[in-house]
């Protein structure tokens, strides 16, 4: 079925609400201050070979687990993450984005890299696909 | 029970190489850090380095740098400390400990009963 | 790296006394609302064990006798009575900047 409007305009926000969810959460760990980050930084993440279309989310969507245990970490009493629902909430935004009628075999990268790496990464991939929806 | 059982006293000759060992048992090993820490003789306590058991990733203190390598097995729930060089200033206690982190703490909950190592020629 | 003083460095106490014992950092242990200040408690050929972690909060199993105060720079370990089995060293650690450090003790010994 060839994108309408609306379904472009659906994606765009869900990949927009996305971006929001990785950027707040590398702006609360990614803080030479907190006194946890050395240690987060010793948790390490599995990267896509390839992250060019939607149907790459799926290696995003096998490192959600991954990712919800590191920042269970980061929380503090004026930094109120809630790792569980904000993981929740990003997977349900992904499994929309991906799709579920495909079923995609992710493939990774030899190298893994440090949660504030896979964070990047995957801003840059929503990034990616944003500019070219608009 | 939770315990992080360490291997035995030591007696090295400088320049002897040297690992040390800190069994965990009781929890899931590869889900938390392990850190270890020298006590030099009638001495207080100093941060050595950190790892994560499941990823094999390290952080050290600056001042032991080079000068000691910790690694672990996940496999067998053991961490290491080793030396490829012992030195006379490396007689000392060290502990493992296990690090908590979650919420708004970071602390040691769980430490091994020490390894003690005397370099002397 | 994070300096920790503690103080006194040694005293003598009878069991039933109220012990005191401060810890002075170099520079703030305080992020973010939360103090990263825990008390140990150290036994001559034993491995430090947990008394009291993010500076008030007591470890499960310690007695509530040990009490933890404090915030940014001051924090102040309290015991209210006393026991035998308290006579040991006690270390102050911050958890709040790497490298982690501890103070240089406080030996609690019989009067």
């Known amino acids: 079925m060839a994108p309408t409007s609306s379904s472009t305009k659906k994606t765009q926000l869900q990949l927009e609400h996305l971006l929001l969810d990785l950027q707040m959460i590398l702006n609360g760990i990614n803080n030479y201050k907190n006194p946890k980050l050395t240690r987060m930084l010793t948790f390490k993440f599995y990267m896509p070979k390839k992250a060019t279309e939607l149907k790459h989310l799926q290696c995003l969507e096998e490192e959600l687990k991954p990712l919800e245990e590191v920042l269970n970490l980061a929380q503090s009493k004026n930094f109120h993450l809630r790792p569980r629902d904000l993981i929740s909430n990003i997977n349900v935004i992904v499994l929309e984005l991906k799709g579920s009628e495909t079923t995609f075999m992710c493939e990774y990268a030899d190298e893994t890299a440090t949660i504030v790496e896979f964070l990047n990464r995957w801003i840059t991939f929503s990034q990616s696909i944003i500019s070219t929806l608009t | 029970e939770v315990q992080l059982v360490q291997s035995g006293a030591e007696v090295k000759k400088p320049g002897e190489s040297l690992k040390i060992s800190c069994k965990g048992s009781g929890y899931a090993f590869s889900n938390y850090l392990i850190e270890w820490v020298r006590q030099m003789p009638g001495k207080g306590l100093e941060w050595m380095g950190v790892?994560?058991?499941?990823?094999?990733?390290?952080y050290y203190n600056e001042k032991f740098k080079g000068q000691v390598t910790i690694s672990a097995d996940k496999s067998i729930s053991t961490a290491y400390l080793q030396w490829s060089s012992l030195k006379a200033s490396d007689t000392a206690m060290y502990y493992c400990?296990?690090?908590?982190?979650?919420?708004?703490?970071?602390?040691?909950?769980?430490w091994g009963q020490g390894t003690t190592v005397t370099v002397s020629s | 790296a994070i300096r920790l003083t503690q103080s006194p460095s040694s005293f003598s106490a009878s069991t039933g006394d109220r012990v005191t014992i401060t810890c002075k950092a170099s520079q703030s242990v305080d992020y973010q609302g939360d103090s990263y200040m825990n008390w140990y408690q150290q036994k001559p050929g034993k491995a430090p064990k947990l008394l009291i972690y993010?500076?008030?909060n007591l470890e499960s199993g310690v007695p509530s006798r040990f009490s933890g105060s404090g915030s940014g720079t001051d924090f102040t370990l309290t015991i209210s009575s006393l026991q035998s089995e308290d006579f040991a060293t006690y270390y102050c650690?911050?958890?709040?900047?790497?490298?982690?450090?501890f103070g240089g003790g406080t030996k609690v010994e019989i009067k």
């Open positions: 790892i994560n058991p499941g990823s094999g990733g390290t």
């Open positions: 650690q911050q958890s709040n900047e790497d490298p982690y450090t």
């Open positions: 993010s500076a008030s």
């Open positions: 400990a296990r690090w908590r982190g979650e919420g708004y703490y970071a602390y040691y909950d769980v």
